[in-house]
Amino acid sequence: ASVATELRCQCLQTLQGIHPKNIQSVNVKSPGPHCAQTEVIATLKNGRKACLNPASPIVKKIIEKMLNSDKSN
């Protein structure tokens, strides 16, 4: 069984290559009873969803940039 069907995780797998310019927003879900792992879910500018690898340095930079832009708005 996949992680998503074993727990209530939303990310079955993570997208490896994604350009920050294609991302509209990012939601970081902390681990909880529903899912034991941190999940990074990006909403793309085309309206689709993608799960990103929270351990990836590029993803960390994307999250940091998004959070900073939220604070400045």
């Epitope: 069984a1 209530r8 939303q10 990310c11 079955l12 797998q13 909403t43 969803k49």
Partner: antibody, heavy 125, light 107 residues
Framework: EVQLLESGGGLVQPGGSLRLSCAAS????????MSWVRQAPGKGLEWVSA????????YYASSVKGRFTISRDNSKNTLYLQMNSLRAEDTAVYYC??????????????????WGQGTPVTVSS | DIQMTQSPSSLSASVGDRVTITCRAS??????LHWYQQKPGKAPKLLIY???NLESGVPSRFSGSGSGTDFTLTISSLQPEDFATYYC?????????FGQGTKLEIK
């Protein structure tokens, strides 16, 4: 045709037990999480419990934790709800629901996209 | 637990009206919210998933929007078959929780 059919409801005395069943057909049962949702007479929807596709993970509302047990038999395509120490406030129509929702290969949402017809449970002396 | 609050609790409208129902979460739930329709004596039916996506077979007069804590369900032009009770539901975390429902009645 995707279908869920509940059974096992009825009248039971306070403190009694009941086991509800939900027979699934028309989809790969073992791949999807399932939930039980109830509705007391004239009231809104209340989520009761959920179980992962393999049955390895279970979740409960605080109002039923320790009294109700959710389980599934994937070989029989059947979901169960064992209800013990029943109280008057457990009186409701009980629905089983499939939690579908795979979007692309990277993202999964949990929406109750298929529901059974409901089975009534009355707890009364 | 995440509390979901719907408003109004009941609403009277006429065929052809545009109707908006709101749902507020007690904490941010991103867009992890669904809308259901229920008619008397029937099981609920999924209308909108993930705040804004129309479930297959649902008429396009239904639409959803919102993210974070505030969400809306809009029916652009009420039809006779739309008179029912509507519920929002979050799945951001367990326990899953529903709003108390909005009963849409004929004026």
């Amino acid at each position: 045709e995707v279908q869920l059919l509940e059974s096992g409801g009825g009248l039971v005395q306070p403190g009694g037990s009941l086991r509800l069943s939900c027979a699934a057909s028309g989809f790969t049962f073992s791949e999807l999480s399932m939930s039980w949702v109830r509705q007391a007479p004239g009231k809104g929807l209340e989520w009761v419990s959920a179980i992962s596709g393999s049955g390895g993970s279970t979740y409960y509302a605080s109002s039923v934790k320790g009294r109700f047990t959710i389980s599934r038999d994937n070989s029989k395509n059947t979901l169960y709800l064992q209800m013990n120490s029943l109280r008057a406030e457990d009186t409701a129509v009980y629905y089983c629901a499939r939690e579908g929702g795979r979007l692309e290969p990277y993202y999964y949402y949990y929406a109750m996209d298929v529901w059974g017809q409901g089975t009534p449970v009355t707890v009364s002396s | 637990d995440i509390q979901m609050t719907q408003s109004p609790s009941s609403l009277s409208a006429s065929v052809g009206d545009r109707v908006t129902i709101t749902c507020r979460a007690s904490q941010s739930i991103s867009d992890n919210l669904h809308w259901y329709q229920q008619k008397p004596g029937k099981a609920p039916k999924l209308l909108i998933y993930d705040a804004s996506n129309l479930e297959s077979g649902v008429p396009s007069r239904f639409s959803g929007s919102g993210s974070g804590t505030d969400f809306t369900l809009t029916i652009s032009s009420l039809q006779p078959e739309d008179f029912a009770t509507y519920y929002c539901q979050q799945y951001y975390s367990t326990p899953l929780t529903f709003g108390q429902g909005t009963k849409l009645e004929i004026k």
